[in-house]
């Protein structure tokens, strides 16, 4: 057991197995479930995280009105197919040969079909609206302090460039964080807004994905910001294709 082995961990993803067996004895970490090598300097893709989660033992007014095309993840957990880069494959199927198309954050964007269903491309989610309700506090948070703290959080904890945090809206007790990132804006090395939103969602639920770190301790000017409800809306570059039956349900 060497010092190198002690150092060989994945700070950004605890759902990994690491060993110093990479090129030249360098540390290499692989995601549970998929066995894919992950870059531990940044966030792991949501697809690989979902796959790892499914493989793990089961234990446990200024406000924005989401557009008519906004998607909410109502389907919950599934074991996804990821491409060699760790992104969601455009078509996902379950063990009973039921298939559907997903967007870049893995949320279903079509009706379910059979194996003949075609999903021509992975449609990018370019706008994410995170809708939070905070627990009652003595008074409202200062909007600019709240804005600065959330931008700092997304930069420092989730490695997301501040330019992708489009806006922070606040009408006590509702906070809305808008993340925007078009395909053309995302450079190599940039964290994907979908991955940042997923890490944030898990943090809020008290299920941090970071290695050995304490949970999320959000404070605005020293005052704890405790979230009691979260809703996340996803807007795709191409609107989803659902039948009228679903839309009128």
């Amino acid at each position: 057991h060497t010092a190198a082995q002690d150092n060989c961990t994945c700070p950004t993803n605890k759902m990994t197995v690491c060993s110093p067996d990479g090129p030249g004895g360098r540390c290499q970490c692989r995601a549970l479930g998929s066995g894919m090598a992950v870059d531990c300097s940044t966030l792991t893709s949501k697809c690989l995280l979902l796959k790892a989660r499914m493989s793990a033992p089961k234990n446990a007014r200024t406000l924005v009105r989401p557009s008519e095309h906004a998607l909410v993840d109502n389907d919950g957990l599934y074991d996804p197919d990821c491409d060699p880069e760790g992104r969601f494959k455009a078509r996902q199927c379950n063990q009973t040969s039921v298939c559907w198309c997903v967007n870049s954050v893995g949320v279903r964007r079509t009706d379910k079909g059979d194996l003949s269903l075609r999903c021509d491309e992975l449609v990018r989610t370019h706008h994410i609206l995170i809708d939070l309700r905070h627990r009652p506090t003595a008074g409202a948070f200062n909007h600019s302090d709240l804005d600065a703290e959330l931008r700092r959080l997304f930069r420092e904890r989730y490695r997301l460039h501040p330019k992708f945090v489009a806006a922070v809206h606040y009408e006590q007790p509702t906070i809305q964080i808008e993340l925007r990132q078009n395909t053309s804006q995302k450079a190599a090395g940039d964290v994907d807004i979908g991955d940042a939103a997923y890490y944030f969602e898990r943090d809020i639920k008290g299920e941090s994905l970071f290695q050995g770190r304490g949970g999320l301790d959000l404070r605005v000017r020293g005052e704890p910001l405790q979230v009691e409800r979260t809703l996340i809306y996803y807007l795709d570059e191409i609107p989803p294709k659902f039948s009228m039956k679903r839309l009128t349900a």
Partner: antibody, heavy 122, light 109 residues
């Protein structure tokens, strides 16, 4: 714990060279970033590139360094910087430094090598 | 993104106090380091996280500030403090910009 750079010296204009940074007393397999910084004679510090030496090998480059400089880490004990198409403006002392955290955006340099002088002249 | 350091040079007597300012063109929270460099030597980390003293650095060195405005104060100046001081951040490293300030030469009379 210390760092040491090697590979500096006199290079002709349009020439190329490879600088190596070796660590002793610690292993490069940790969860941190290694950086190259340079300093022209009598001038300030200028960041060139950095590489994550844990699992992943992510890199970042200064805008002006992209395409001409390449940072790499092929072993758990060394980081290299390759430079091409050198000009007199690249004459400087080149330092390697170890970042203190896993997060590239919250990094400061707690260990530096003594530097190696690169002179570009015909 | 740019780090602007002022002044470029300052001269104070032994026992005096020097104040160096560093301004970031955008909010960098508390992600700022201060370094001391003497001729022929690599820089030495003095302060990180805007105000935390690095190991072995005397308490005469004090860092403060957050957001865009930062200050390094050296009190009870000693001859050994004669050096060039740099501020540094990596907050916007993905923009490919130099995170170092231009440097401040401190002369101790």
């Amino acid at each position: 714990q210390q760092l040491e750079e090697s590979g500096g010296g006199l290079v002709k204009p349009e020439g190329s060279l490879t600088l190596t940074c070796k660590g002793s007393g610690f292993d490069f397999s940790g969860t941190y970033w290694m950086w190259w910084v340079r300093q022209a004679p009598g001038k300030g510090l200028e960041w060139i590139a950095c590489i994550y030496v844990g699992s992943g090998s992510s890199t970042y480059y200064a805008s002006w360094a992209k395409g001409r400089f390449t940072i790499s880490s092929t072993s758990s004990t060394a980081v290299t910087l390759q430079a091409t198409s050198l000009t007199a403006a690249d004459t400087a002392t080149y330092f390697c430094a170890r970042g203190a955290t896993n997060n590239v955006f919250m990094n400061y340099f707690n260990l530096w090598g003594p530097g190696t002088l690169v002179t570009v002249s015909s | 993104f740019e780090m602007t350091q002022t002044p470029s040079s300052v001269s104070e007597p032994v026992g005096g106090t020097v104040t160096i300012k560093c301004q970031a063109s955008e909010d960098i929270s508390s992600n700022l380091g201060w370094y001391q460099q003497k001729p022929g030597q690599p820089p030495k980390l003095l302060i990180y996280g805007a105000s935390t003293l690095a190991s072995g650095v005397p308490s005469r060195f004090k860092g403060s500030g957050s957001g865009t405005e930062f200050t390094l104060t050296i009190s009870d100046l000693e001859c050994a403090d004669a050096a060039t001081y740099y501020c540094q951040t990596s907050y916007y490293i993905d923009d490919g910009v130099n995170g170092f300030g231009g440097g401040t030469e401190v002369v101790v009379k």
